[in-house]
């Protein structure tokens, strides 16, 4: 014969937001303040995450779901569930062990996080440089030189202009 799940375990009737209270004959008690249970049938409630220090509260804790944090301005989330915050840099920079440093010549970063990446090599696609790259922006590749001057055999793409006053690290 088939037993229902509730006959096997009275705790299975306890919904999310409650816990099965062994101290009170296994009745379903609401989660205490600053705690939650996201699934039914739990014997304890989990402590809510507190968004302190560099963390800000993105979503408040409820009886059925944990709080969610993000980072204070000037920082961005790292890791699953924003487990850490890492400082932003400016566009045209990357975060090194020594803090935010300008991208080396020939590389760019158009975001406040991440690393500097090399400019696109237009000539690999048989194209020419239409707009030179900067620390903040990739080069813009244009039509191939042959497209620009019909009948011409091959034209060497112009080298990107070196940014004045910027030396590689």
């Amino acid at each position: 014969f088939e037993r229902t799940r509730s006959l096997q375990d009275p705790c299975s009737n306890c919904p999310a937001g409650t816990f099965c209270d062994n101290n009170r004959n296994q009745i379903c008690s609401p989660c205490p303040p600053n705690s939650f249970s996201s699934a039914g049938g739990q014997r304890t409630c989990d402590i809510c995450r507190q968004c302190k220090g560099v963390f800000r509260t993105r979503k408040e804790c409820s009886s059925t779901s944990n709080a969610e944090c993000d980072c204070t301005p000037g920082f961005h989330c790292l890791g699953a569930g924003c487990s850490m915050c890492e400082q932003d840099c400016k566009q045209g920079q990357e975060l090194t062990k020594k803090g935010c440093k300008d991208c080396c010549f020939g590389t760019f970063n158009d975001q406040k996080r991440g690393i500097c990446r090399p400019w696109t090599n237009c000539s690999l696609d048989g194209k020419s440089v239409l707009v030179n790259g900067t620390k903040e922006r990739d080069v813009v590749c244009g039509p191939s030189p042959a497209d620009l001057s019909p009948g011409a055999s091959s034209v060497t793409p112009p080298a990107p202009a070196r940014e004045p006053g910027h030396s590689p690290q």
Partner: nanobody, 123 residues
Framework: EVQLVESGGGLVQPGGSLRLSCAAS????????MIWFRQAPGKGLEWVAN????????YYVDSVEGRFTISRDNAKNSLYLQMNSLRAEDTAVYYC????????????????WGQGTTVTVSS
């Protein structure tokens, strides 16, 4: 409970010195990078310095290089910031923060912060 508590701030004249301390508890201090940040009045948070688990690697923002020294005593679960040749622009609330454990892929990622200690440089 994981906790960081800063101390040692105060009022100091330009050119003077202060030593900030940060007492850590509730976690294995020697497993983590540690970081000092500061926030000047009306400004955003600024990274100042960080130090790896055994103290063999130390890094500083350019504006304090040669004037500030970060150090740690793992036996005492303590982080320090020795600040010399202080300037008016060093006036800020200074925070110590727990960094990565070496496996996080970031030397600047933080999760636990202290409440801060105020440093005022003025004549």
């Amino acid at each position: 409970e994981v906790q960081l508590v800063e101390s040692g701030g105060g009022l100091v004249q330009p050119g003077g010195s202060l030593r900030l301390s940060c007492a850590a508890s509730g976690f294995t201090f020697s497993n983590y990078w540690m970081i000092w940040f500061r926030q000047a009045p009306g400004k955003g948070l600024e990274w100042v310095a960080n130090i790896n688990q055994d103290g063999s690697e130390k890094y500083y923002v350019d504006s304090v290089e040669g004037r500030f020294t970060i150090s740690r005593d793992n036996a005492k679960n303590s982080l320090y910031l020795q600040m010399n040749s202080l300037r008016a622009e060093d006036t800020a609330v200074y925070y110590c923060a727990r960094g990565g454990d070496g496996y996080s892929g970031s030397h600047h990622g933080t999760d636990v912060w202290g409440q801060g200690t105020t440093v005022t440089v003025s004549s």
